[in-house]
C-alpha cells in the first residue's frame, strides 16, 4: 500500500519527541498512602514528548490524524504520546481481610507511540 | 481499592471534553487517490477534546498521569484523547494484480478515552 511509514528519528532534536521517561513518585503524591504499603516509592515510567508528523505512528488512524492535522490544525489535533504497552507492577496493599500482593497490568508504561 | 474512578461528565462545558467527532476527508486529503478507488469520500471518526482531571481515564496509568500532572504540570503532561476502539472500514484499492477489497481495522475510531 501507499501508506506512509512511521518514522523513528526525531526532527525536533534529542529528547523532544515522544519517549518513555521515569518519574519518581511517593504514595503521598498518588494519594495511595492509605491503602498501598509497598513499594513506598514508585518508579513511574510515563510517555512524554511531542508527536511531529508521522513520528512513531501507532497505526493507520494516527497517520491519517497526522495528515489531517497538517491540513486542518484547528479542527484535528496532532497525535499525542501515549503508552503502547505496560509493565506489570506488584503492589502490597491493604484489603478488608489483611494484606495482599496484587499485580497491576496497566500502571506503568513500557513503550510509547503517537496515537 | 482507593483508586479514583474515571468521571464521565465534562466540567469544561458541552463538547469541550474528549469525544468522538466526524471529520470529512477526500482521498486527496489523505494522499490516497493513487491507490484507493472507493469510497472517494471518507467519514473519519476521530477523538478530539480535552482531558480534564480523571475524565474518561483509560486505566490506572491515566489516573496516575492526571494526578501527577496536577502536581508537576511542567514535567508530566495531561492525559490526552485517543481512540479506545476502532470501527473496521472496507476499502477498494489497486493491487499489483488488479483491484481488491480489504478491511482495515485501525482506520476509524469508534470510541475515545483519555490516556
Amino acid at each position: 500500500s501507499a501508506h506512509a511509514h512511521p518514522r523513528d528519528s526525531c526532527p525536533l532534536g534529542p529528547g523532544r519527541c515522544c519517549h518513555l521517561e521515569t518519574v519518581q513518585a511517593t504514595l503521598e503524591d498518588l494519594g495511595w498512602s492509605d491503602w498501598v504499603l509497598s513499594p513506598r516509592q514508585l518508579q513511574l515510567s510515563m510517555c512524554v514528548g511531542e508527536c511531529p508528523h508521522l513520528y512513531r505512528s501507532a497505526n493507520t488512524h494516527a497517520q491519517i490524524k497526522a495528515r489531517l492535522h497538517g491540513l486542518q490544525p484547528d479542527k484535528v489535533p496532532a497525535p499525542c504520546c501515549v503508552p503502547s504497552s505496560y509493565t506489570p507492577v506488584v503492589l502490597m496493599h491493604r484489603t478488608d481481610s489483611g494484606v495482599s500482593l496484587q499485580t497491576y497490568d496497566d500502571l506503568v508504561a513500557r513503550g510509547c507511540h503517537c496515537a | 481499592s482507593a483508586h479514583a474512578h474515571p468521571r464521565d461528565s465534562c466540567p469544561l462545558g458541552p463538547g469541550r471534553c474528549c469525544h468522538l467527532e466526524t471529520v470529512q476527508a477526500t482521498l486527496e486529503d489523505l494522499g490516497w487517490s493513487d491507490w484507493v478507488l472507493s469510497p472517494r469520500q471518507l467519514q473519519l471518526s476521530m477523538c478530539v477534546g480535552e482531558c480534564p482531571h480523571l475524565y474518561r481515564s483509560a486505566n490506572t496509568h491515566a489516573q496516575i498521569k492526571a494526578r501527577l500532572h496536577g502536581l508537576q504540570p511542567d514535567k508530566v503532561p495531561a492525559p490526552c484523547c485517543v481512540p479506545s476502539s476502532y470501527t473496521p472500514v472496507v476499502l477498494m484499492h489497486r493491487t499489483d494484480s488488479g483491484v481488491s477489497l480489504q478491511t482495515y481495522d485501525d482506520l476509524v475510531a469508534r470510541g475515545c478515552h483519555c490516556a
Epitope: L37, P39, Q43, T87, V89, M92 | -
Partner: antibody, heavy 119, light 112 residues
C-alpha cells in the same frame, strides 16, 4: 513459580572483582514494585543486605559497601548481576540473590553460592 | 542504620510445645500508615532463608498458621504455637522501615 539461580566463580583473588549473575526463571524480571536483591552471609554468621535493583534500573546499595558495589540488570536475558570490587578475605561469604517487594518481603531466594577470597 | 537485637541466641525446644523469639529494634519500625515494617525469616540447615512473616504480623504464602508475629514499635515476637521437628533452624528478624534493611543476629532453634 519464580526460581532464582546464582552463578559465578567460587574463588576470587584479593583486590580483584567478584562477579555473580542471578538468572530468574518462571517470571519476568521486568516487573515494577519488585527489587532484585543481593544478600550475603559470612560463614557461620548472620545475613547482610548488599543492595538491589528495580525494573527501571534504579539501584539501592548498603552504604557500608556502596563504594565497591555495582548491581545491573539484563532484561533480555532475565538476569541481574553483582560486582564487588577490591575484595578482601572479609568478603568471603555465601551470596544469595532474592526477589523483594521493594526492600522487604524476600519471598524467593536462590540456593546461594559460596565465594572464597583467597590468593 | 537500624540495629536489630534478637534473644535468645539459642532456643532448645520440645516438639508439641510452644516457642517464642524476641526481636528489638534501635528505633521504632511503626510507619505512619499504622504498619510495622518488620519481616521474619527461617533458615533451615543447609538451605536458603525463607519468608515467614512480613509487616510484623502477616503470614507469608504457604506458611503454617502455627507461626505468628506480634509487637509494635521496637519490640516484636515470633511465636510457634506447637513446635514441629521441621521448624529447626535459625530465625532472623529484619527491619524494612528504611534503607538499608538490617537483620538481627539470629536465634537458633533446636530440638532438646
Amino acid at each position: 513459580q519464580v526460581q532464582l539461580q546464582e552463578s559465578g566463580p567460587g574463588l576470587v583473588k584479593p583486590s580483584q572483582t567478584l562477579s555473580l549473575t542471578c538468572t530468574v526463571s518462571g517470571g519476568s524480571i521486568s516487573s515494577g514494585g519488585i527489587y532484585w536483591t543481593w544478600i550475603r552471609q559470612h560463614p557461620g554468621k548472620g545475613l547482610e543486605w548488599i543492595g538491589a535493583i528495580a525494573y527501571s534500573g534504579s539501584t539501592y546499595y548498603n552504604p557500608s559497601l556502596e563504594s565497591r558495589v555495582t548491581i545491573s540488570v539484563d532484561t533480555s536475558k532475565n538476569q541481574f548481576s553483582l560486582k564487588l570490587s577490591s575484595v578482601t578475605a572479609a568478603d568471603t561469604a555465601v551470596y544469595y540473590c532474592a526477589r523483594g517487594i521493594e526492600y522487604q518481603h524476600f519471598d524467593y531466594w536462590g540456593q546461594g553460592t559460596l565465594v572464597t577470597v583467597s590468593s | 542504620d537500624i540495629v536489630m537485637t534478637q534473644s535468645p541466641l539459642s532456643l532448645p525446644v520440645t516438639p508439641g510445645e510452644p516457642a517464642s523469639i524476641s526481636c528489638r529494634s534501635s528505633q521504632s519500625l511503626l510507619h505512619s500508615n499504622g504498619y510495622n515494617y518488620l519481616d521474619w525469616y527461617l533458615q533451615k540447615p543447609g538451605q536458603s532463608p525463607q519468608l515467614l512473616i512480613y509487616l510484623g504480623s502477616n503470614r507469608a504464602s504457604g506458611v503454617p498458621d502455627r507461626f505468628s508475629g506480634s509487637g509494635s514499635g521496637t519490640d516484636f515476637t515470633l511465636k510457634i504455637s506447637r513446635v514441629e521437628a521441621e521448624d529447626v533452624g535459625v530465625y532472623y528478624c529484619m527491619s524494612t522501615l528504611e534503607l538499608p534493611p538490617t537483620f538481627g543476629g539470629g536465634t537458633k532453634v533446636e530440638i532438646k
